[in-house]
C-alpha cells in the first residue's frame, strides 16, 4: 500500500517517501526505489536553512554600503548573510535592507533609549525641572540649574529648552 | 522462506532475443521493487534494470537502455527481463535480487545468457 | 554515472587477520553504500547496508563504516568461510553502481 504520509525530514512523490535534502543542500533527483534523493552543497554566496526540496539555493544578502549597509555575520551554506548599519545609523526594518540616520532629539526633547543598529532613538519630553536646548541623538534631558546650592537666587525661570539663569541675591541694606 | 528462482537463459546469436523469468515465493511479491544484475565471466557485478513493486517505475542502466524491458506479473509472482538486439558483451550470469529499502537482501541463483555465433 | 573504486583489487591474509577493504566514490554519497559478498559459482550475499549497518544474520566480525566519498569493510578475525570477493554499491545517485571487487585469498 502506497504511503499518503511521510516521516520527518522526507517528502511524498510518485507514491514514495523520498528524504529531504539537508540544510546547505539543494535538490538534483528525486529518490526512485532503487537511489536514494540526489543532493549537492549549495555553491559560494549561496544557502539554504532548511530541510528542503529545493532545486536551486537562495543567493546571500548583499550588503550594500551605498545603502549604510555593512555586513555584521556572514553567511554560510546553511545561513543567509545579516548585514546590519554604519555607526550613527539604524536599519529601516527586521530584514535590514536599508539604513537611515538616528533621528536627533530636538530641543525641549531629550534622548529616553539610545538608538541601536536595528532600532531609532526613542525621545521624551522634558519634564519640568529639566531642559535640553541642543538637538541630539544621544543628549538627555538635563536638570535646571540648582541656583540655591550656589547661594544665586533664579532671575529667569526655566523652560523645557532653557535653563534657569540664576543671579546674586538682593542684599539688605 | 524467500526464494528467488531465473530461467530463461541460453545461447542466442548476436541481434537476437531472449526473455528471462525470475519466479518468487516466500514473501508479498508486488509489494516489493525488484532488479536484474549480471556479471560477465571472471568480471565484476553490473545492475540492468530494476522495477518498482506496481510496475509504475522501471530503471535502465545505459548499457541496456533501448534494448531490454524488464516488467512484472505480481498476480504470477514473476518478474522478466525481455532482451532484444543481443550482443557479446551481454554474455553474463543473470541474477534476479529483491529490492527492500535501498539493498539487495535476496537473490536468486542465476541464469548464464551466452550471446554468440 | 558514480564510478566506485575499490582498494586493494586482491588481498592475501590468513585465518585470524584483520582485514579492511576501502572503497572510494566519485562524488558524494553521504552513506549510502551497501557492502555484499560473492563465493565462486553463488550469488551475491547482503552483508553491510547504508554504510554501518549489519545485515541481519551477518556475523558481528564484519563492520562498515565512512560517508562521504570514502567508505571501509572491515573483517576483525578472519574465519575460512570468509574468503571470498567483495563488493560495494552505492545507491547515491542513479543507477545504483558497484565498485569492481576485491578478492580475499588464503595466504
Known amino acids: 500500500e502506497p504511503p499518503t504520509a511521510c516521516r520527518e525530514k522526507q517528502y511524498l512523490i510518485n507514491s514514495q517517501c523520498c528524504s529531504l535534502c539537508q540544510p546547505g543542500q539543494k535538490l538534483v533527483s528525486d529518490c526512485t526505489e532503487f537511489t536514494e534523493t540526489e543532493c549537492l552543497p549549495c555553491g559560494e554566496s549561496e544557502f539554504l536553512d532548511t530541510w528542503n526540496r529545493e532545486t536551486h539555493c537562495h543567493q546571500h544578502k548583499y550588503c550594500d554600503p551605498n545603502l549604510g549597509l555593512r555586513v555584521q555575520q556572514k553567511g554560510t551554506s546553511e545561513t543567509d548573510t545579516i548585514c546590519t548599519c554604519e555607526e550613527g545609523w539604524h536599519c529601516t526594518s527586521e530584514a535590514c535592507e536599508s539604513c537611515v540616520l538616528h533621528t536627533p532629539c530636538i530641543p525641549g526633547f531629550g534622548v529616553m533609549e539610545m538608538a541601536t543598529e536595528t532600532t531609532d532613538t526613542v525621545c521624551e519630553p522634558c519634564p519640568v525641572g529639566f531642559f535640553s536646548n541642543v538637538s541630539s541623538a544621544f543628549e538627555k534631558c538635563h536638570p535646571w540649574t540648582s541656583c540655591e546650592t550656589k547661594d544665586l537666587v533664579v532671575q529667569q525661570a526655566g523652560t523645557n529648552k532653557t535653563d534657569v539663569v540664576c543671579g546674586p541675591q538682593d542684599r539688605l541694606r | 522462506e524467500v526464494q528467488l528462482l531465473e530461467s530463461g537463459g541460453g545461447l542466442v546469436q548476436p541481434g537476437g532475443s531472449l526473455r528471462l523469468s525470475c519466479a518468487a515465493s516466500g514473501f508479498t511479491f508486488s509489494s516489493y521493487a525488484m532488479s536484474w544484475v549480471r556479471q560477465a565471466p571472471g568480471k565484476g557485478l553490473e545492475w540492468v534494470s530494476g522495477?518498482?513493486?506496481?510496475?509504475?517505475?522501471?530503471s535502465y542502466a545505459d548499457s541496456v537502455k533501448g534494448r531490454f524491458t524488464i516488467s512484472r506479473d505480481n498476480s504470477k509472482n514473476t518478474l522478466y527481463l525481455q532482451m532484444n538486439s543481443l550482443r557479446a558483451e551481454d554474455t553474463a550470469v543473470y541474477y534476479c535480487?529483491?529490492?527492500?529499502?535501498?539493498?539487495?537482501?535476496?537473490w536468486g541463483q542465476g541464469t548464464l545468457v551466452t550471446v554468440s555465433s | 554515472d558514480i564510478q566506485m573504486t575499490q582498494s586493494p583489487s586482491s588481498l592475501s591474509a590468513s585465518v585470524g587477520d584483520h582485514v579492511t577493504i576501502t572503497c572510494r566514490a566519485s562524488q558524494s554519497i553521504s552513506s549510502y553504500l551497501n557492502w555484499y559478498q560473492q563465493k565462486p559459482g553463488k550469488a551475491p550475499k547482503l552483508l553491510i547496508y547504508a554504510a554501518s549497518s549489519l545485515q541481519s544474520g551477518v556475523p558481528s566480525r564484519f563492520s562498515g563504516s565512512g560517508s562521504g566519498t570514502d567508505f571501509t569493510l572491515t573483517i576483525s578475525s578472519l574465519q575460512p568461510e570468509d574468503f571470498a570477493t567483495y563488493y560495494c554499491q552505492q545507491y547515491g545517485s542513479a543507477p545504483p553502481t558497484f565498485g569492481q571487487g576485491t578478492k580475499l585469498e588464503i595466504k
Open positions: 522495477i518498482g513493486g506496481s510496475s509504475s517505475y522501471t
Open positions: 535480487a529483491r529490492y527492500y529499502s535501498y539493498h539487495m537482501d535476496y
